[in-house]
């Protein structure tokens, strides 16, 4: 907390500029008008303030806006955003995607901080759902974002937003999350033709039920083993040898290398040896 002291003669700030970097903390407190700071926030980022000086500037804004900053200020916080606590951010009402992007840019290249997580949470709750543009933005900055959400949170994702999802965005999703996302993806891509549909739906198949896998096996999709290994065990077990062979196509040979791993191991144990022998892979049930 900086003590209240009068501003020395001639030091009253007329605008936010480079001369302020030579001000001591108490001088910034005394000589910079909070309202001026708020209207010229966009200039702060261009000035190499120390962390201590930024603390003073934040303190001034906190005094001016005890109920939370307006979006016009938030959008131009820049590196001052890194000084905010989750408690500060919970007071904000961020509705503009541009504001969100500007703040995410400040944290770019770093892990998602508690501040960023709070910001995103506030933004998404304010919008009511994870629309396509928001999802596009969030996954661009944080590819693992989608998989950080709970199944309950994912249920608010509209099918139209699924178009923004890239395969790498689902890399860390667990089966429970894919169970929620798969039906949305199926709905989103339903009007695509066979091969195009498979390319899009492939990343979501960890949530697919047996009947959908059976249907895919009739379409010459040539599923790769990496995708097959991520399928739900309970969805794979009822598939016949013929269905798995048609589902994997030329990749069926890969079953040999995975015969000791789930779901392949459990599936092999469910099959008749005569049926397994038709594959010519030496699989032992």
């Amino acid at each position: 907390e900086v003590e209240k002291t009068a501003c020395p003669s001639g030091k009253k700030a007329r605008e936010i500029d480079e001369s302020l970097i030579f001000y001591k903390k108490w001088e910034l407190e005394a000589c910079v008008d909070a309202a001026l700071l708020a209207t010229q926030m966009d200039r702060v980022n261009a000035i190499p303030f120390t962390y201590e000086q930024l603390d003073v500037l934040k303190h001034k804004l906190d005094e001016l806006y005890p109920q939370g900053y307006p979006e016009s200020v938030i959008q131009h916080l820049g590196y001052l955003f890194l000084k905010m606590s989750p408690e500060d951010i919970r007071k904000w009402n961020v509705t503009s995607l541009e504001t969100l992007k500007a703040l995410l840019e400040v944290n770019k290249g770093h892990e998602m901080s508690p501040q960023v997580a709070t910001l995103i949470d506030r933004f998404v709750k304010g919008r009511g759902q994870l629309d396509k543009d928001t999802l596009d933005t969030l996954t661009a900055f944080y590819p693992g974002y989608l998989c950080s959400l709970s199944p309950e949170e994912l249920s608010s994702v509209p099918p139209s937003s699924i178009w923004a999802v890239r395969p790498q965005d689902l890399d860390t999703c667990d089966p429970r999350q894919l169970d929620v996302l798969y039906p949305k993806a199926r709905l989103a891509f339903q009007n695509m033709n066979g091969s195009e549909y498979f390319v899009k739906i492939q990343s979501f198949l960890g949530g697919a039920p047996t009947e959908d896998l059976k249907a895919l096996s009739q379409q010459n999709v040539s599923m790769d083993l990496a995708t097959f290994m991520k399928l739900r065990t309970d969805a794979v077990l009822p598939l016949t040898v013929a269905e798995v062979q048609k589902l994997l196509g030329p990749h069926v040979e890969g079953l040999k290398a995975e015969e000791r791993h789930r779901p392949v191991r459990d599936w092999i144990l469910r099959q008749r040896q005569d049926d397994l022998d038709t594959l010519g892979l030496g699989l032992q049930g």
Epitope: A242, K246, G249, P250, V252, G280, L281
Partner: nanobody, 122 residues
Framework: EVQLVESGGGLVQPGGSLRLSCAAS?????MGWFRQAPGKGREGVAH????????VYADSVKGRFVLSRDNSKNTMYLQMNSLRAEDTAMYYC??????????????????WGQGTLVTVSS
């Protein structure tokens, strides 16, 4: 359309060896050798998944025949050792692009060579 050309057949004495070759016009993931003796049906002899090289053999040739491939030449080879009179047949090379049915069933394969004759006789 995959073109398959076999070679290497001929006359050999019992206990002798032959090496059959099958050259494909393009890469295929799955290739096999079938044979058909006079008056009999076509039977699967051996099969290879060309990418990983996984092989399987009919019980009647296991331990005597060895299947290999050279992917740089899109060619499959069948080394036949300890040949017997009952190995006499027309040997066909086959390839498939659609994966249905057993490796030993001719109906599972969509491309075939013209065949090369192997005669085992003293």
């Amino acid at each position: 359309e995959v073109q398959l050309v076999e070679s290497g057949g001929g006359l050999v004495q019992p206990g002798g060896s032959l090496r059959l070759s099958c050259a494909a016009s393009e890469f295929t993931y799955s290739m096999g050798w079938f044979r058909q003796a006079p008056g009999k049906g076509r039977e699967g002899v051996a099969h290879i998944y060309t990418r990983g090289g996984t092989t399987v053999y009919a019980d009647s040739v296991k331990g005597r025949f060895v299947l290999s491939r050279d992917n740089s030449k899109n060619t499959m080879y069948l080394q036949m050792n300890s040949l017997r009179a009952e190995d006499t047949a027309m040997y066909y090379c086959a390839a498939r692009t659609i994966f249905e049915g057993s490796w030993s069933s001719p109906s599972s394969f969509d491309f075939w060579g013209q065949g090369t004759l192997v005669t085992v006789s003293s």
